[in-house]
């Protein structure tokens, strides 16, 4: 039975040209995290494998940085980065947990940043 829950930063906004940290946290389960995928719609941004570490998709290599923790930092944001982002936790023995974050990239310099979630 899957008992875990994913906490995310929820809906966040950031300024064009700036950067943002996408964070998810899996709690309420003792399942072992084997891999975390970060995806934007159907595009793979990055993967953190428990054994082998981070792989950043070549198309995002210059704009994505791993961390902090299992989170992901998006840099040099453009309006086209607006949309849904998913953290997909692959765990054993539970299976897969998915969290959703909506990012809005604003042209304005008064972008309201959502609270940045930190892994304890």
């Amino acid at each position: 039975m899957m008992t875990g829950t994913i906490e995310t930063t929820g809906n966040i906004s950031a300024e064009k040209g700036g950067s943002i940290i996408l964070q998810c946290h899996l709690s309420s389960t003792t399942a072992q995290v084997t891999q975390v995928n970060w995806e934007q719609q159907d595009q793979l941004l990055a993967i953190c494998n428990a054994d082998l570490g981070w792989h950043i998709s070549p198309s995002f290599k210059d704009r994505v940085a791993p961390g902090p923790g299992l989170g992901l930092t998006l840099q040099s944001l453009t309006v086209n980065d607006t949309g849904e982002y998913f953290c997909i936790y692959h765990t054993y023995p539970d299976g897969t947990y998915t969290g959703r974050i909506f990012l809005e990239v604003l042209e304005s310099s008064v972008a309201e940043h959502g609270a940045r979630f930190q892994i304890p």
């Epitope: 793979l44 494998n49 054994d51 082998l52 570490g53 981070w54 792989h55 940085a65 791993p66």
Partner: antibody, heavy 128, light 108 residues
């Protein structure tokens, strides 16, 4: 041409130290994981350890048989990989290979890891 | 750590024959992290197969790989004189990376 060339092997006494080098050319060194693999005379292949790439902060990991005695490092500005071997034992006698580790994910989200480029090897003999 | 057991230890065959090499893991491994290498005397290993079944660049199609879970197979459909060598399987996840003990394919 993608190439790896090891050097630094030789004869050393038990308890001694040796530093192996691996010069890489023909590819973007900083993007790749790099592994050391050894082969004792007449035996099979044994993984020694690896250093991850820049994205992974050059994290290093080692086989249990060498942990605490061997240290892997790299200098991306020189496209070079190193293996510092201390407290050498007779059972460390082997040909040492450096190899390029390919770590990536396909469009199917399947992960891959394999060693696609190997050096010619350098011989380390530990004997009194 | 995962132990990879290769069998047979030695395979004696004639050119033109089919070679079937086995690699068995002590526990389940992801097929995408399973590779096969060929090594000839005095030479470095050469990558043949990765992801259990994908041929590396420049590898002839007489080499094929298959399997999943704990059982993997390397098949050489028709042995050529240059195929007589030692073959190793390797897995990378879970850590640490391990190799099988090798199978020597020799001329009968």
């Amino acid at each position: 041409e993608v190439q790896l060339v090891e050097s630094g092997g030789g004869l050393v006494q038990p308890g001694g130290s040796l530093r192996l080098s691996c010069a890489a050319s023909g590819f973007t060194f900083t993007d790749y994981y790099m592994d050391w693999v050894r082969q004792a005379p007449g035996k099979g292949l044994e993984w020694v350890g690896r250093t991850r790439n820049k994205v992974n902060s050059y994290y290093t990991e080692y086989a249990a048989s060498v942990k605490g005695r061997f240290t892997i490092s790299r200098d991306d500005s020189k496209n070079s990989l190193y293996l510092q071997m201390n407290s050498l034992k007779t059972e460390d006698t082997a040909v040492y290979y450096c190899a390029r580790g390919q770590y990536y994910y396909g469009s199917d989200r399947r992960g891959y890891y394999y060693m696609d480029v190997w050096g010619q090897g350098t011989t380390v003999t530990v004997s009194s | 750590e995962i132990v990879l057991t290769q069998s047979p230890g030695t395979l004696s065959l004639s050119p033109g024959e089919r070679a079937t090499l086995s690699c068995r893991a002590s526990q389940s491994v992801s097929s995408s992290y399973l590779a096969w290498y060929q090594q000839k005397p005095g030479q470095a290993p050469r990558l043949l197969i990765y992801g259990a079944s994908s041929r590396a660049t420049g590898i002839p199609d007489r080499f094929s790989g298959s399997g999943s879970g704990t059982d993997f197979t390397l098949t050489i459909s028709r042995l050529e004189p240059e195929d007589f060598a030692v073959y190793y399987c390797q897995q990378a996840v879970p850590s640490p990376l391990t190799f099988g003990g090798g199978t020597k394919v020799e001329i009968k």
